[in-house]
Each structure stands twice: as C-alpha cells, then as structure tokens.
C-alpha cells in the first residue's frame, strides 16, 4: 500500500499535526506545574482515509476490515508517530525542580 | 492521573483487545499470501474515557483539551501498545517464501 501523504478529503482534513494553545488550567496542571504558564500543545488530529499515512501492516488490515464491517471495526486513527521532549518547572515539597517529559508533545503523526 | 483499567462505561465498552476472524479476501491479501487462509486478527477497539489506560502524558493532555474543546480536539483513541509477530507464506516470482511481520497483530492496547 502507498504510504500516501495527499489527503483525498481536501487540504487539512486528514491526519496531521495541529497546535492548540493551552494554559496550565486548561491542561489540569495548575496545581503542580509553575512554568511555562502556557503551552503550544502539538497533537495529531484528522481523518485516516485508506492508504493515508498508514503506520504499518496493522493499519492496512484495520482499514480493510473497517470497510467490510464498519459497525464492528473502527477506521484507523490519527496518533503521534513520535514526540518532542519538553521541560517543566514543577512544584516540589522543598521548592521547585526541573523535569523533562519525552511523551508530551506530538512531533509527527500517522494512522494506526 | 491513574492509569485505570476499570471501564466506567460498562464491561467490554472501553479500549481493549478484540479478535476479528478474517479471510485472505477480507484482508485484501488473496493475491500475495498463500497461508494462513484465515487469520484471527487481534485489534484494539473501544472507547477511551478519562484516565482509562492512558498511554502517556500526551493522552492526559488530549483528554483534558477534549473536555474543553470537544469540537476541536478529539478524545484519545484506542491503539496497539505492542504487537505479536506473525509468519505468512507468500507468493514470490520463483515460488513461495516465509516472511515474519512484527506489526500485524495487536498484543495489548492503550489510549493515545
């Protein structure tokens, strides 16, 4: 199957990286994170039509079975293929500390 | 956040491993696979409510933003956390060959 990158549904409709501006309150982090106060959250959003950014063989199978049994098998879904790391300044019992997270911000997307 | 395993929507409704019986024709493999003729395809299906099998920090963020902006940010979705390998007997130009695929059958599931 072609690991297609052209969206048959029209520009911007298929699985891709989106940026959502969020505050600590939006993220539910206000009680344990001090900084940054706002985060540009990158996440994977969009439809996964046939052969579009298929992550692997499982995604191909899932799409074929979804076509056959749409009520039983959902279409593949748009999820991160990799992540960008991010460092947060956190509250601790003794003050503040730095902590790095490697699974927080999506870097690129595919359909699984 | 708790990495919960109890489904608040009722038994079997949340993200979990399902088995779907499929023929080579169902999978679109009839022209290049000889065996097995039928496959018990394991895949991840089900809802991803808050704190259920959250894969990582990104999944937590996505759920929090989904609650705030449901029209913009979709809920996390149920995808394989790991895979089981599978061997196929394939047709080749010269006859047949054995090929192992390590990304074909879901082994367990989580929400991303």
């Amino acid at each position: 199957a072609r690991n297609g990158d052209r969206c048959p549904l029209g520009p911007g409709r298929c699985c891709r990286l989106h940026t959502v501006h969020a505050s600590l309150e939006d993220l539910g982090w206000a009680d344990w994170v001090l900084s940054p106060r706002e985060v540009q959250v990158t996440m994977c959003i969009g439809a996964c039509p046939s052969q579009f950014r298929e992550a692997n063989m499982h995604a191909q199978i899932k799409m074929n079975l979804h076509r056959l049994k749409p009520d039983t098998v959902p279409a593949p879904c748009c999820v991160p293929a990799s992540y960008n790391p991010m460092v947060l300044i956190q509250k601790t019992d003794t003050g503040v500390s730095l902590q790095t997270y490697d699974d927080l911000l999506a870097k690129d997307c595919h359909c699984v | 956040a708790r990495n919960g395993d109890r489904c608040p929507l009722g038994p079997g409704r949340c993200c979990r491993l399902h088995t779907v019986h499929a023929s080579l024709e169902d999978l679109g493999w009839a022209d290049w696979v000889l065996s097995p003729r039928e496959v018990q395809v394991t895949m991840c299906i089900g809802a991803c409510p808050s704190q259920f099998r959250e894969a990582n920090m990104h999944a937590q963020i996505k759920m929090n933003l989904h609650r705030l902006k449901p029209d913009t940010v979709p809920a996390p979705c149920c995808v394989p956390a790991s895979y089981n390998p599978m061997v196929l007997i394939q047709k080749t130009d010269t006859g047949v060959s054995l090929q192992t695929y390590d990304d074909l059958l879901a082994k367990d599931c989580h929400c991303v």
Epitope: L34, R37, N84, P85, M86, V87, I89 | -
Partner: antibody
Amino acid sequence: EVQLVQSGAEVKKPGESLKISCKGSGYSFTSYWIGWVRQMPGKGLEWMGVIDPDGSYTIYSPSFQGQVTISADKSISTAYLQWSSLKASDTAMYYCARYGRYGTYFDYWGQGTLVTVSS
Amino acid sequence: QSVLTQPPSVSGAPGQRVTISCSGSSSNIGVLYVNWYQQLPGTAPKLLIYSNDNRPSGVPDRFSGSKSGTSASLAITGLQAEDEADYYCQSWDSSSNYVFGGGTKLTVLG
C-alpha cells in the same frame, strides 16, 4: 531579531562582589527561560542554572547551588548572574542563553561576559 | 569529568565526511534527546541540531544528527574550512539537569 546582549568584561579581586547582566530583545522576554553557562579558559561548557523571568523561578545546577544567584527584572527584559564573594576559580567566560520553546535546548546565546578574578 | 563523553579532537580534509560521537548512559541520552552546538573560535556557541535530528533554520543540511541507544553522533558532510570549531553535545540528566559533553575540536586539514 532575537538578541541577548551581555554586559562588558569585568576584572575583580578575590572577595569582591559582582553582578553581570543579559538584556533580551526582539521577543517576549517573559515567554522564554534564560539559562547561564560557564566556560573556564580552554575548557568546555557547564550549565549553571535557569530562571523563568515571568515568575522568577530559579533552579541551579548542584555544582553552582549556593555559589551564585540568578535573578531577572522583567520590566527591563534583563537577567542577572551575581556573586557575593568572588574566587580566582570564578575566572571564566559566562554566557546567557535563551531556552527554546520546549525548554530542552538553548536557541539563542549572548556574546559572553569575561570575568577575571585576580589579586 | 563530563557526564557525556566526546572525542577531544577529529579532523578531515575539505569535502570529506566526519562524525563526532557523544556517549552517555541510560539516565540521559538513553531515554532522552541530544542537542548539538557549534562554537567557532572566539565566539559564543550556536545551536546546530536539536532533539536528536532537527536543524534550526539557517543551518546547512551538511549537518545532521542521529541517536542510537545511549550514544549520539553529529555528521558533517562536504567539510569546509569554516566548519573548523569546537562542537558540544548536550542532553538532560536526572541528577544534574542540563549536561554538556566535553567538546570536540574539529580541524579541517590542508
């Protein structure tokens, strides 16, 4: 254009105090952390600490905790590094650097301030 | 002693390809990211590669980064005289936060 402009070279005697500065321009100063990095003569880079200019939260490398103080004045977009009692071993080039958006790397650097401590 | 280990020096002729290694452990490079900086003689460091393999705008594609296990490497192809500089890897370590390698001096021969 993003710029970090540091104060000029300093020559001091052991035991004296010192405060060097780093002025940011061309971006929202409070939206990015500022770090300080030491480079002793002929040596490599050492991370000293970081400040969030917005909330003035500071975190120090264990090697520099209690040896220096990092501060910021967001009204004039300036970060500071200061010593209350200098030692000869503080002789080095000191760089301020802006953290990238995710706080994992330094995307812009000041030109450096050379501090010489000698009796 | 740096937490991240780099060779003190490497060299290559103009047009050649050179690589600079950066060895860490499971508490830094092994689980996280690596950034690379170039420091030309008498100047401040400059970001060259971030998050293992990403180039900031303005950095030529002759420079590339990669990571495998607990090691990372910086590759420079089509070596040029102006590439002569010190190169530093940087990562994160849970005990000391931001850590740098000891630096590698690149000499362009000829």
